[in-house]
Interface confidence: low
């Protein structure tokens, strides 16, 4: 979970060690303020639940990757 | 912290082939993407491929494409990029780089290639 | 393959000014866009990515801006280290192309 240390900035302190199916996932964010320990994403599922991750390992790009061609619609 | 540590200068004849290694340190290479990026002397930086080491998927530019062939040892954290049928024009500097979403945030020190008769 | 048009190609500034690079996609790379620094005979150096996030430890003097097909890269205050050259590159979509480099040299 997300911890909001002095609103309006999140940071990450712990990410998720599983995998989450792209199918769960609704919309993500990038954390990278310097106020934070670790530059992160946080992923929001369907249920509305935020979730960590961590942006340097692969399902987390992949996924990240997957949401954004979701919400690109293609130029006529 | 992250560090990439590349084999050393080579000399090769043309028409042969080089093998550059990659060792990671810092990382499980098993977690992200090893890309593989060249530089020509005097000349800009060009994306060669990628490999997941995870699953030994690859990604090539179509003007490397059967040229060239990138592979990892998980076991020992180390990526290869191994270059044939040189050329001249493959006279560069070799980079490997860690890819974060396409983009290279911890990069090698460079491997300098060069290809002469 | 997407192009990247990086201009110019070269300056020459004092240590103080505000430099300002461009980067021209042939299409829209929706803000799939680094900047990198490079120094001779050095690896370049990652300054930052997602076309507006700064990599951690990369002085707040450099920012970058743009969305659709054209990017900047701004130093707002330009330092004796910050005389190098500095590459634009797409991750929108593989393979990964860079811009052709633009040279900051002391005037």
């Known amino acids: 979970q997300p911890d909001a240390i002095n609103a309006p900035v999140t940071c990450c302190y712990n990410f998720t060690n599983r995998k989450i199916s792209v199918q769960r996932l609704a919309s993500y964010r990038r954390i990278t303020s310097s106020k934070c320990p670790k530059e992160a994403v946080i992923f929001k599922t369907i249920v509305a639940k935020e979730i960590c991750a961590d942006p340097k390992q692969k399902w987390v790009q992949d996924s990240m990757d997957h949401l954004d061609k979701q919400t690109q619609t293609p130029k006529t | 912290q992250v560090q990439l540590v590349q084999s050393g200068a080579e000399v090769k004849k043309p028409g042969s082939s080089v093998k550059v290694s990659c060792k990671a340190s810092?990382?499980?290479?098993?977690?992200?993407?090893m890309h593989w990026v060249r530089q020509a002397p005097g000349q800009g930086l060009e994306w060669m491929g990628r490999?997941?080491?995870?699953?030994?998927?690859?990604k090539f530019d179509p003007k490397f494409q059967g040229r060239v062939t990138i592979t990892a040892d998980t076991s020992t954290s180390t990526a290869y990029m191994e270059l044939s049928s040189l050329r001249s024009e493959d006279t560069a500097v070799y980079y490997c780089?860690?890819?974060?979403?396409?983009?290279?945030?911890?990069w090698g020190q460079g491997t300098t290639v060069t290809v002469s008769s | 393959d997407i192009q990247m048009t990086q201009s110019p190609s070269s300056l020459s500034a004092s240590v103080g000014d505000r430099v300002t690079i461009t980067c021209k996609a042939t299409e829209d790379i929706y803000n799939r866009l680094a900047w990198y620094q490079q120094k001779p005979g050095k690896a370049p150096k990652l300054l930052i990515h997602?076309?507006?996030s700064l990599e951690h430890g990369v002085p707040s003097r450099f920012s970058g801006s743009g969305s659709g097909t054209d990017y900047t890269l701004t130093i707002s205050s330009l330092q004796p280290e910050d005389f190098a050259t500095y590459y634009c590159q797409q991750f929108r979509s593989a393979p990964y192309t860079f811009g052709g480099g633009t040279k900051v040299e002391i005037k």
């Open positions: 490999i997941d080491p995870d699953n030994h998927n690859t």
């Open positions: 997602g076309a507006t």
């Open positions: 810092g990382l499980t290479i098993s977690h992200t993407y």
């Open positions: 780089a860690r890819g974060v979403f396409g983009f290279f945030d911890h």
